[in-house]
């Protein structure tokens, strides 16, 4: 709040803008006939050292030269950089209860001669574009430094354009706003920055170039795809370019790939065939421009073309499996799966399937299409039958895959020997098995199949299955395997006109069975008593049941029970027991054990045999 | 109708200053390049300077560190202050105004890329 300088005037020397460490001399002098009234003698000038509006400093011991009542002179040193506000204050030392008056300020700038701007770099965004360069301007002033960029050229012109750096901006690029033409491909351009304060100038080195060292052609575009004769492996790739490209660098992926698949072209002038391509694929395609073979800088990659390629017939095998049931002395049906191909055998949607089976000797042929990968039918149980599957799409199908249909565990002389399952981990079980000992005909595969022991998972849910090759003893079985779930897993040898299959149960997690089983009935049949449960419920059974114990003992007896232990076998839910005493009531019940150990106690029963007991 | 007028020119002598105005009228040229151009008997136009709309300063080498084009876009004029004047600098001086602000270097010095011209004001250089 000075009402600017009316009492009087502040001065600085050698100047206001002063370089790091240097000393400036402020004087403050009054105006004639300012001052303290009456008493010309009593005025005292006082400097006061303000930093961001803050008080810093009274440098009234300061005082370099001094006329008193008339003005002061002030030494100040060891200025930081920047800027810092001198206040000159009259102070009238007759009157000590009025604050001091101002008189007049002055701001002092500390900083710097600007260094020689290095590192200058030039651009032009396409042919089009505007000449942008950018530098590095060096350790910063402190003070409010003008930049000046120029660029001669070829036809007697120079271009120059400024900025400036305070401390509220910074300079260090500037576009001209020139567009240099690719005539003047091969000249030479000059571009210099010279940067100016009050504390002195400098100028950058000359820095040289030519039109193709600078111009970054624009990213190609409109970028598109043509497939020769719908082909999904061969398509040209067309694109529009600036003029003076002669070289382009293609790219392009399956969307779901992390590798890029490279191509430079040269002279492509907009086009380019592509011969590798994966049928029905999704693709990402992209380009980047340069003007000139050796020199100058490639675009940014155009934005991205992304589509399907067209699709093509199906190639590959289905891999085909099956399941026979007799129906009655005369029918049985056969049940045919097969697993979808993977989409570089498929090319394309799979619309349909294309299904036979077919009497060999009789040639009855039975044919339809599915959308589903399984399908039923009953067929009389004589004869030699053989399917065959094939998957169809929009341009055409695969060749057909053969099955014979042969009893798939009919020979005892082909089952596998000693078949084992063990848990790997969470979701993987480990089978293996020894080659079947006395096989009259040769074991052409082995077919290792799963499914889950629930109740109704035959009906519900198709099989899993591996194709393992003849002189292989061992799968690793992980589709759909889930922990604490059991599973019945049948190795079957195959020849050519034959099979036969060992089962066994396995599971990749277990733990002891949440409850026990539940006796529902005990009855007494020529002395011997037949306990009757029923299953545990298959969430609570946590893995492969191995066996069940059924516990009995007097009621009220402390002493330990006694206990029979079953195999387990997924039909029978009952059974005898023979060593009660008759006429002494007994206290039954169930537990289930799995390899993590051993149930909780079912439900207690009580009974009392009455007939002679063994 | 767009009328360019200079002034500011006269007799002064060699290593003498001299500062030449454009006042543009009947539209604005902020968003245009406008040049300075000097013909002498005989021969054809000759670029000395331009400034485009972005204030880009452009100048023929002959003239350049002694030349400098500058506008003023609220009076809708532009100037050449010419400092260390050379005999050879004497000529008829041209004001014009380019109608698209076209950025590309070839055009700043054909007087073809230029729709809008001055009469013209002498500049004279004695020894």
């Known amino acids: 709040n000075i009402d600017v300088c009316k009492l009087g005037t502040v001065t600085v020397q050698p100047a206001p803008v002063i370089p790091l460490g240097s000393a400036a001399n402020i004087s403050c002098s009054l105006n004639p006939k300012q001052g303290c009234s009456h008493y010309p003698s009593s005025n005292e000038l006082i400097l006061l050292k303000f930093v961001n509006d803050v008080l810093v400093e009274n440098l009234h011991g300061k005082k370099v030269h001094d006329h008193t009542g008339h003005s002061s002179t002030f030494q100040v040193t060891n200025l930081s950089l920047g800027m810092t506000l001198f206040v000159c204050k009259l102070n009238c030392s007759n009157s000590q209860k009025k604050p001091p008056v101002p008189v007049c300020g002055v701001e002092i700038s500390v900083g710097v001669a600007p260094e020689p701007p290095q590192n200058i770099s030039c651009v032009q965004e396409g042919e089009n574009g505007t000449v942008a360069c950018s530098w590095n301007s060096g350790k910063v002033t402190y003070l409010k430094t003008n930049y000046t960029l120029q660029l001669s050229g070829p036809n007697n012109l120079t271009c120059q354009k400024q900025c400036f750096s305070d401390n509220r901006q910074n300079c260090n690029r500037l576009d001209l706003g020139i567009n240099l033409s690719p005539d003047l491909a091969e000249s030479r351009f000059i571009v210099r920055v010279t940067a100016i304060n009050d504390l002195g100038n400098s100028s950058s080195l000359p820095h040289t170039f030519t039109f193709l060292d600078i111009v970054i052609p624009l990213p190609p575009w409109d970028i598109r795809i043509n497939f020769l004769n719908a082909s999904g492996s061969r398509g040209t790739l067309q694109w529009e370019d600036e003029g003076q490209v002669v070289l382009n660098q293609l790219r392009y992926q399956p969307l779901n790939s992390t590798s890029w698949n490279m191509v430079n072209a040269t002279n492509a002038k907009g086009k380019y065939d592509l011969r590798d391509l994966r049928p029905f694929t999704e693709y990402e395609f992209q380009i980047s421009s340069k003007l000139h073979l050796s020199g100058g800088s490639w675009s940014n990659w155009s934005e991205s073309l992304r589509t399907r390629t067209p699709e093509e017939e199906p190639v590959g095998i289905l891999d085909i499996w099956y399941m026979k049931q007799d129906i009655d002395y005369d029918r049985q049906q056969i049940s045919l799966f097969w697993k979808s191909l993977n989409p570089s055998e498929a090319r394309g949607k799979i619309l349909h399937y294309q299904v036979t089976l077919q009497e060999v000797t009789k040639k009855t042929t039975l044919q339809n299409t599915t959308r589903h990968t399984s399908w039923t039918r009953v067929i009389p149980r004589t004869g030699a039958w053989t399917a065959s599957v094939s998957a169809a799409n929009s341009k055409g199908a695969s060749a057909p895959t053969h099955i014979n249909i042969v009893d798939l565990c009919g020979t005892g002389l082909l089952a596998p020997h000693q078949v084992s399952a063990k848990s790997e981990n969470m979701d993987n079980i480990l089978v293996t098995w020894q080659p079947p000992k006395k096989a009259d005909s040769a074991v052409r595969e082995y077919i290792v199949e799963w499914r889950a022991l629930q109740p109704g998972s035959i009906t519900k849910f198709p099989p899993h299955w591996l194709r393992i090759p003849p002189d292989n003893m061992s799968a690793l079985i992980s589709e759909n395997i889930k922990p604490y779930i059991c599973y019945e897993i049948r190795v079957h040898a195959l020849s050519e006109s034959q099979g036969g299959c060992s089962s066994i149960r396995g599971d990749s997690k277990h733990k002891a069975p949440v409850s026990g089983p539940h006796i529902t009935a005990i009855t007494e049949k020529k002395e011997r008593l037949f306990i009757s449960w029923t299953h545990i419920p298959f969430p609570e059974q946590r893995g492969c049941i191995l066996h069940y114990r059924i516990y009995w003992k007097e009621r009220d007896s402390t002493a330990q029970p006694e206990l029979c232990e079953i195999q387990y076998r997924r039909s029978q839910n009952s059974h005898p027991i023979s060593s009660l005493q008759p006429r002494v009531t007994y206290v039954l019940w169930m537990t289930a054990v799995t390899a993590a150990g051993e149930s909780p106690q079912g439900n207690e029963r009580e009974f009392c045999p009455q007939g002679k007991a063994n | 109708q767009v009328q360019l007028q200079e002034s500011g020119g006269g007799l002064v002598q060699a290593g003498g200053s001299l500062r030449l105005s454009c006042a543009a009228s009947?539209?604005?040229?902020?968003?245009?390049?406008m040049g300075w151009f000097r013909q002498t008997p005989g021969k054809e136009r000759e670029f000395v300077a331009a400034?485009?709309?972005?204030?880009?300063?452009v100048y023929a080498n002959s003239v350049k560190d002694r030349f400098t084009i500058s506008r003023d876009n609220a009076k809708n004029t532009f100037y050449l202050q010419m400092h260390s004047l050379k005999l050879e600098d004497t000529a008829v001086y041209y004001c014009?105004?380019?109608?698209?602000?076209?950025?590309?270097?070839?055009?700043?010095?054909?007087?073809?890329?230029?729709?809008?011209w001055g009469q013209g004001t002498q500049v004279t250089v004695s020894s």
């Open positions: 009947g539209r604005t040229f902020s968003k245009s390049t």
């Open positions: 400034i485009t709309w972005t204030d880009t300063e």
């Open positions: 014009a105004g380019d109608r698209y602000g076209s950025s590309r270097d070839s055009v700043f010095s054909s007087p073809t890329n230029y729709p809008y």
